[in-house]
């Protein structure tokens, strides 16, 4: 069971300092941006991280949404990352959900975060280069200290 607590507006970056944004095709991509670029591209660079109380605290249960014309929420249905047009619900009566991720910190580095899927244990949000694009994907954690599954989350409010 997950019960919604509060939401924060955040900028999410990979460890190469590239900013996560939603492109015109609703794809989550990372790109080099200055702070002014980041502001100019809002709201596509501003994510609503909603925190949920979890009956079993395994990390901070969160949804990640964005509000352009409408609110879309990140989903990892069938291990494929996409934004679905929906508001983060107030309650989820299950222990797993395609839109719930466990946000966890890295010891000694409070600003470094990982996001594990609640539906697919051991699968994490990651940044992966595909041709010229840096994409947000769901990836099975495989190697020691994998930097691609680590992000910084900067609260904007």
């Amino acid at each position: 069971y997950f019960g919604k607590l509060e939401s924060k507006l955040s900028v999410i970056r990979n460890l190469n300092d590239q900013v996560l944004f939603i492109d015109q095709g609703n794809r989550p991509l990372f790109e080099d941006m200055t702070d002014s670029d980041c502001r100019d591209n809002a709201p596509r660079t501003i994510f609503i991280i909603s925190m949920y109380k979890d009956s079993q605290p395994r990390g901070m249960a969160v949804t990640i949404s964005v509000k352009c014309e409408k609110i879309s929420t990140l989903s990892c249905e069938n291990k494929i990352i996409s934004f679905k047009e929906m508001n983060p619900p107030d309650n989820i009566k299950d222990t797993k959900s395609d839109i719930i991720f466990f946000q966890r910190s890295v010891p000694g580095h409070d600003n470094k975060m990982q996001f594990e899927s609640s539906s697919y244990e051991g699968y994490f949000l990651a940044c992966e280069k595909e041709r010229d694009l840096f994409k947000l994907i769901l990836k099975k954690e495989d190697e020691l200290g994998d930097r691609s599954i680590m992000f910084t989350v900067q609260n904007e409010d």
Epitope: L5, Q56, P57, R58, G59, Q103, P107
Partner: antibody, heavy 120, light 107 residues
Framework: QVQLVQSGAEVKKPGSSVKVSCKAS????????ISWVRQAPGQGLEWMGG????????NYAQKFQGRVTITADESTSTAYMELSSLRSEDTAVYYC?????????????WGQGTLVTVSS | DIQMTQSPSSLSASVGDRVTITCRAS??????LNWYQQKPGKAPKLLIY???TLQSGVPSRFSGSGSGTDFTLTISSLQPEDFATYYC?????????FGQGTKVEIK
């Protein structure tokens, strides 16, 4: 740098209660867990329970359920552990430990420990 | 509850020795295991998390391996400051538990 400072040593009588405090500084308090871990003389580490202040409710190890109460005051960034119905085997060093964001999956900062002696 | 069994409970070794400590979980915990070092009168110190990731500031002579139920902490070349007690901790479920500890003493 995160720092956890605990209250001083206590001597208690069997059957009484003890309340130990743990004041956090230098980091985010509300969304990171605070756990209590005890260590009896010459023994190992025992997780008693913990709290994530933003959640409000605490989680307890089965062994201590009903006898321990863990609370947190976000306004002062202080966590508390109260153990009731004390017996001699509760004589131990009690540590508070800061855990991960929203959970108990590691403990990277520890308090200095509080010795609680239960003796008649 | 998941039980954690460490072996040996104590060992004697010399400076420069390679030391191995094992930790066995009563059920599979994936890589959700941490290792701590504790010196007398001091609080524990996190050495390794998620089975094999070295905590920042910890010397590289410490390493962790294993997944599922069997895990190992290795000190490749024991140094005088490494004589201490070592604990494993599982966090597969939020009810976390520690192993009983392994004391590393000077031979």
């Amino acid at each position: 740098q995160v720092q956890l400072v605990q209250s001083g040593a206590e001597v208690k009588k069997p059957g009484s209660s003890v309340k130990v405090s743990c004041k956090a500084s230098g980091g985010t308090f509300s969304t990171f867990s605070i756990s209590w871990v005890r260590q009896a003389p010459g023994q190992g580490l025992e997780w008693m329970g913990g709290i994530i202040p933003i959640f409000g409710t605490a989680n307890y190890a089965q062994k201590f359920q009903g006898r321990v109460t863990i609370t947190a005051d976000e306004s002062t960034s202080t966590a508390y552990m109260e153990l009731s119905s004390l017996r001699s085997e509760d004589t131990a060093v009690y540590y508070c430990a800061r855990g991960g964001y929203g959970g108990y999956y590691y403990f990277d900062y520890w308090g200095q420990g509080t010795l609680v002696t239960v003796s008649s | 509850d998941i039980q954690m069994t460490q072996s040996p409970s104590s060992l004697s070794a010399s400076v420069g020795d390679r030391v191995t400590i094992t930790c066995r979980a009563s059920q599979s915990i994936s890589n959700r295991l941490n290792w701590y070092q504790q010196k007398p009168g001091k609080a524990p110190k996190l050495l390794i998390y998620k089975g094999s990731t070295l905590q920042s500031g910890v010397p590289s002579r410490f390493s962790g391996s294993g997944s599922g139920t069997d895990f190992t902490l290795t000190i490749s070349s024991l140094q005088p400051e490494d004589f201490a007690t070592y604990y494993c901790q599982q966090h597969k479920v939020w009810l976390t538990t520690f192993g009983q500890g392994t004391k590393v003493e000077i031979k």
